[in-house]
């Protein structure tokens, strides 16, 4: 009795959905009452399917309402675990254990990343010095550095601070500011550069003709 996995590594975005699969041998018909399926992650029980039904009482609270075994797939010889609204804490090594006549288990790794895609921006001006303060802020994982550039591709020196997000413990809140003397319609770019997996997200900031008071604020979506 051997379980097979088509993938032993899944990479998914924060807030997205993932379905991890373990395949097991099945005859032309499946006897649900002889099938045992366990899905676990480290010390957390996610799925315990015994005697044709899931025992939700044993499910770890962090997976409540988010994890389910796709029952229709069992008849195709697939123990498919679906996790919705994926969190950073879901990352880790999952184990599927299947008992069906024989018994076997396999390990699958889930990696979760959060792109710095939703970039908020703000432009303000010092009425005395006429210096503009450009600000970009986004949340993501893992940490990112912010690179400021001008429309003529000059790299500019900004100041970046990284704090923990209020939304989720492991998420990073990255804020970067650039102080610069600029003229109306000049264009600047803030690029959130993240490693592992490598991904760049850029927002464009256009200096307005005339800044109202207080400073204008808009959110830029990639």
């Amino acid at each position: 009795f051997t379980i097979t996995v088509s993938k032993d590594l899944y990479v998914v975005e924060y807030g997205g959905n993932v379905t991890m699969e373990c395949k097991f041998p099945v005859e032309k018909q499946l006897n649900l009452f002889a099938l045992i399926v366990y899905w676990e992650m480290e010390d957390k029980k996610i799925i315990q399917f015994v005697n044709g039904k899931e025992d939700l009482k044993v499910q770890h609270s962090s997976y409540s309402q988010r994890a389910q075994l796709l029952k229709d797939q069992l008849f195709l010889g697939k123990a498919a675990l679906q996790i919705t609204d994926v969190r950073l804490q879901d990352a880790g090594v999952y184990c599927c254990l299947i008992g069906y006549g024989g018994a076997d288990y396999k390990r699958i790794t889930l990696k979760v990343h959060a792109p710095y895609r939703n970039i908020s921006q703000r432009i303000s001006v010092d009425p005395v010095t006429s210096e503009h303060e450009l600000m970009c802020q986004a949340e993501g994982y893992p940490e990112a550095e912010v690179i400021w550039t001008s429309s003529d591709h000059r790299v500019l020196s900004g100041k970046t601070t990284i704090t923990n997000s209020n939304r989720e413990e492991k998420l990073f809140n990255v804020t970067s500011t650039l102080n610069i003397n600029a003229t109306a319609n000049e264009i600047f770019y803030c690029t959130f550069q993240r490693s592992g997996p490598e991904e760049n997200n850029t927002a464009e900031l256009v200096i307005p003709e005339r800044l109202p008071v207080p400073a204008s604020e808009r959110t830029h979506f990639m």
């Epitope: 005859e27 002889a34 045992i36 006549g101």
Partner: antibody
Amino acid sequence: EVQLVESGGDLVKPAGSLRLSCVASGFTFSSYSMSWVRQAPEKGLQLVAWIDAYAGVTSYANAVKGRFTISRDNAKNTVYLQMNSLRAEDTAMYYCARGQGGRSSFDYWGQGTLVTVSS
Amino acid sequence: SYVLTQLPSVSVTLRQTARITCGGDSIGSKNVYWYQQKLGQAPVLIIYDDSSRPSGIPERFSGANSGNTATLTISGALAEDEADYYCQSYDIPLTGTVFGGGTQLTVLG
């Protein structure tokens, strides 16, 4: 080499008890379901009891339900058949058989142990 | 419960083709297994999943399964093939195993 060796067969009086054992070697015992299949003299094969490799799911022939109990000790690579309230019609050669990995078939069989129920 | 029907005996001339049948309601929708049992010995699995042969089983043994009948074919039967042959399927997979009554094959000549 896969080997299954049964023992415990004997001559026993009606209403008596017996415990059959089957010691397995040559494979990862805890990964396979195991069964007891019997064959009465000059008769065909009949599945007596089945036990899953994991979590101890069991199944019995209607003729033995409530009288026979199948169990396994994965640490000892052994499967047992506890037979109570024996009847004359339980007289048979009892074979221990290995499940063929998630299938209903049996890919290896022991040589059998004879149980005779007679007064 | 599920019933598998086999003819009690079948004869074949040496090196001719023997066909042993196993009847069951919609048996084609289930997997069928075949065992050979020689006198005084334990059964041996010779066909699984309708038509697959375990390693070490000669190519002259083949299986088919459709509709209400599964068939074991021995192409060019030898004297050593003289034995009882049992088909096996299930009512419920795994836990509901059912055997046919067995067919005694006699090889003549």
